[in-house]
């Protein structure tokens, strides 16, 4: 559902973020300290444009634990 050229909008975007971020939670706008470019927010990035898994993960609230 989040391959190249695909868009995620509305509830599908919310559900996908919940799945990707799991119990970490997520932001709809990245904290400025974590943004490596002008942050547009995930609706802009994934619904108005297309996004991938790596981009989705940047909106998770805390970094994934490395096992």
């Amino acid at each position: 559902a989040y391959g190249p050229g695909e868009t995620l909008c509305g509830g599908e975007l919310v559900d996908t973020l919940q799945f990707v971020c799991s119990d970490r939670g997520f932001y709809f706008s990245r904290p400025s300290s974590r943004a490596n470019r002008r942050s547009r927010g995930i609706v802009e990035e994934c619904c108005f444009r297309s996004c991938d898994l790596a981009l989705l993960e940047t909106y998770c609230a805390t970094p994934a634990k490395s096992e």
């Epitope: 868009t7 995620l8 909008c9 509305g10 509830g11 599908e12 975007l13 919310v14 559900d15 709809f28 547009r40 609706v43 802009e44 619904c47 108005f48």
Partner: antibody, heavy 120, light 107 residues
Framework: QVQLVQSGAEVKKPGASVKVSCKAS????????MHWVRQAPGQGLEWMGI????????SYAQKFQGRVTMTRDTSTSTVYMELSRLRSDDTAVYYC?????????????WGQGTTVTVSS | DIQMTQSPSPLSASVGDRVTITCRAS??????LNWYQQKPGKAPKLLIY???SLQSGVPSRFSGSGSGTDFTLTISSLQPEDFATYYC?????????FGGGTKVEIK
């Protein structure tokens, strides 16, 4: 109070363009996305697209791609919807409507509607 | 695109009746379903969002339920001001789509 006030009725000829305005008040204009929805006479509701008033980014329904342009003026808290190459089946009431959140939870504030009649 | 189908239409009822309107999505939309009321010559009004959450200011006689593909809007005791057309709308993915509407008429 929170409200959206739209421009007045328009009569256009086929092939022409129309630009409808929607002025927001009573809330922070740049904090909420704005939808455009239309309703042909005696018909249901049809979503046309959405604009982010903060940055001006847009997403349009494929049906209207290439014919619709949504813009905004943050200095007047107004969004605009322009539809070009009008046809008779574009005759409808056009509504702006505020997005609740993330495009996921509906539209909670609506303009009063603008009637656009396309007739030769 | 996700197709939304409403039934019945029209619906004839009397004041005090319990009224149920159904909406079916062509694919699963989880709980991303909203209900609107529209009166002639007026803009739609949001009643229920996320399938079952009552919008602020909406009377408690309105309720919504369902998930996946099947949803219902219930008016527990129909009031004179409730005679109107009701639309469901999916907000799972774009393009956002609406049902064809259910007109609640006086019996």
């Amino acid at each position: 109070q929170v409200q959206l006030v739209q421009s007045g009725a328009e009569v256009k000829k086929p092939g022409a363009s129309v630009k409808v305005s929607c002025k927001a008040s009573g809330y922070t204009f740049t904090s909420y996305y704005m939808h455009w929805v239309r309703q042909a006479p005696g018909q249901g509701l049809e979503w046309m697209g959405i604009i982010n008033p903060s940055g001006g980014s847009t997403s349009y329904a494929q049906k209207f791609q290439g014919r619709v342009t949504m813009t905004r003026d943050t200095s007047t808290s107004t969004v605009y919807m322009e539809l070009s190459r009008l046809r008779s089946d574009d005759t409808a009431v056009y509504y702006c409507a505020r997005d609740v959140q993330w495009l996921a939870y509906g539209m909670d504030v609506w303009g009063q509607g603008t009637t656009v009649t396309v007739s030769s | 695109d996700i197709q939304m189908t409403q039934s019945p239409s029209p619906l004839s009822a009397s004041v005090g009746d319990r009224v149920t309107i159904t909406c079916r999505a062509s694919q699963s939309i989880s709980s991303y379903l909203n209900w609107y009321q529209q009166k002639p010559g007026k803009a739609p009004k949001l009643l229920i969002y996320a399938a079952s959450s009552l919008q602020s200011g909406v009377p408690s006689r309105f309720s919504g339920s369902g998930s996946g593909t099947d949803f219902t809007l219930t008016i527990s005791s129909l009031q004179p001001e409730d005679f109107a057309t009701y639309y469901c709308q999916q907000s799972y993915s774009t393009p956002l789509t609406f049902g064809g509407g259910t007109k609640v008429e006086i019996k």
